[in-house]
Interface confidence: medium
């Protein structure tokens, strides 16, 4: 449930151009995950249920956290890189 | 449960300083920012500012950026806001509140009466 | 900073009617949130980015709009619903608040 999810972020530099990773930590509430058709690959969870996760960034699905995280426009930050910096 | 439990009420003097205090407790500290939002009757609900417990790093609104200091302690899970230089103005009830969307959880609020 | 106008800024209803209460964006933002607050109580979200419901909150609350007019409906006024209700914003920082609506029960 996408409104359960827990959407604060370890802001961290990623490169020279001030970027933020975005990492909630999203409990899967017990729901067994699907798996991608093919080689029993696992569907990229930012292509469905976090596809709105980012209001201006990029989804990127950590697989050792299971959770979604997001790599901010330039000069957007914040937990969802929701706001336009000071 | 996601709880953050806030010090008592504050009865301070005018240009004294102020540490209030909010204890985390049901998650993660370090992985979640800790805003604060000052309530006033004038004012309404003004939002002072945010800190990152695992990096330190913080971010405020210009108007309290001379006003508020925030800080964390890691080992016992607390987030602490001091104000300084105190008046009338700073009279209010100060949260500190943590984002799920917004801003879901909330602690019950300290109350600060600046008077002499 | 983006300044938020809510109106009106007291109103009243009876049970059962229906209530709709606005916020104005000085500057058009992205998403809206609300929240309700009762005496002695911190605040309560209620809505997220403008439209989804928070956990826990009845259907009957319901958010909408975009560019600078957001509005908050309640389908059918309930006692309990007697509050003061906050919008906010944060596509810019500082994140900011309109100075609310009172609701009261007729």
């Known amino acids: 449930d996408l409104q359960e999810a827990d959407l604060d972020l370890l802001r961290v530099t990623l490169s020279s151009k001030p970027q933020a990773l975005a990492t909630p930590n999203k409990e899967e509430h017990g729901k067994r995950k699907k798996k991608g058709k093919g080689l029993g690959k696992k569907r990229d969870p930012c292509l469905r249920k976090y596809k709105d996760f980012c209001i201006h960034g990029e989804c990127k699905y950590v697989k050792e956290l299971r959770a979604p995280s997001c790599i901010c426009h330039p000069g957007y930050h914040g937990e969802r890189c929701h706001g336009l910096s000071l | 449960e996601v709880q953050l439990q806030q010090s008592g009420p504050e009865l301070v003097k005018p240009r004294a300083s102020v540490k209030i205090s909010c204890k985390a407790s049901?998650?993660?500290?370090?992985?979640?920012?800790m805003h604060w939002v000052k309530q006033s009757p004038e004012k309404s609900l003004e939002w002072i500012g945010e800190?990152?417990?695992?990096?330190?790093?913080?971010t405020y609104n210009q108007k309290f950026k001379a006003k508020a200091t925030l800080t964390v302690d890691r080992s016992s899970s607390t987030a602490y806001m001091q104000l300084k230089s105190l008046t009338s103005e700073d009279s209010a009830v100060y949260y500190c509140?943590?984002?799920?969307?917004?801003?879901?959880?909330w602690g019950q609020g300290t109350l600060v009466t600046v008077s002499a | 900073q983006i300044v938020l106008t809510q109106s009106p800024a007291i109103m009243s209803a009876s049970p059962g009617e229906k209530v709709t209460m606005t916020c104005s964006a000085s500057?058009?933002?992205?998403?809206m949130y609300w929240y309700q607050q009762k005496p002695g109580s911190s605040p309560r979200l209620l809505i997220y980015?403008?439209?989804n419901l928070a956990s826990g909150v009845p259907v009957r609350f319901s958010g909408s709009g975009s560019g600078t007019s957001y509005s908050l409906t309640i389908s059918r006024m309930e006692a309990e619903d007697a509050a003061t209700y906050y919008c906010?914003?944060?596509?810019?920082?500082?994140?900011?608040f309109g100075g609310g609506t009172k609701l009261e029960i007729k």
């Open positions: 509140t943590r984002i799920t969307w917004a801003f879901a959880y």
């Open positions: 049901g998650y993660s500290f370090s992985g979640y920012y």
């Open positions: 800190i990152n417990p695992s990096t330190g790093g913080i």
């Open positions: 500057s058009s933002v992205t998403y």
């Open positions: 980015d403008t439209s």
């Open positions: 906010q914003q944060w596509s810019s920082y500082p994140p900011t």
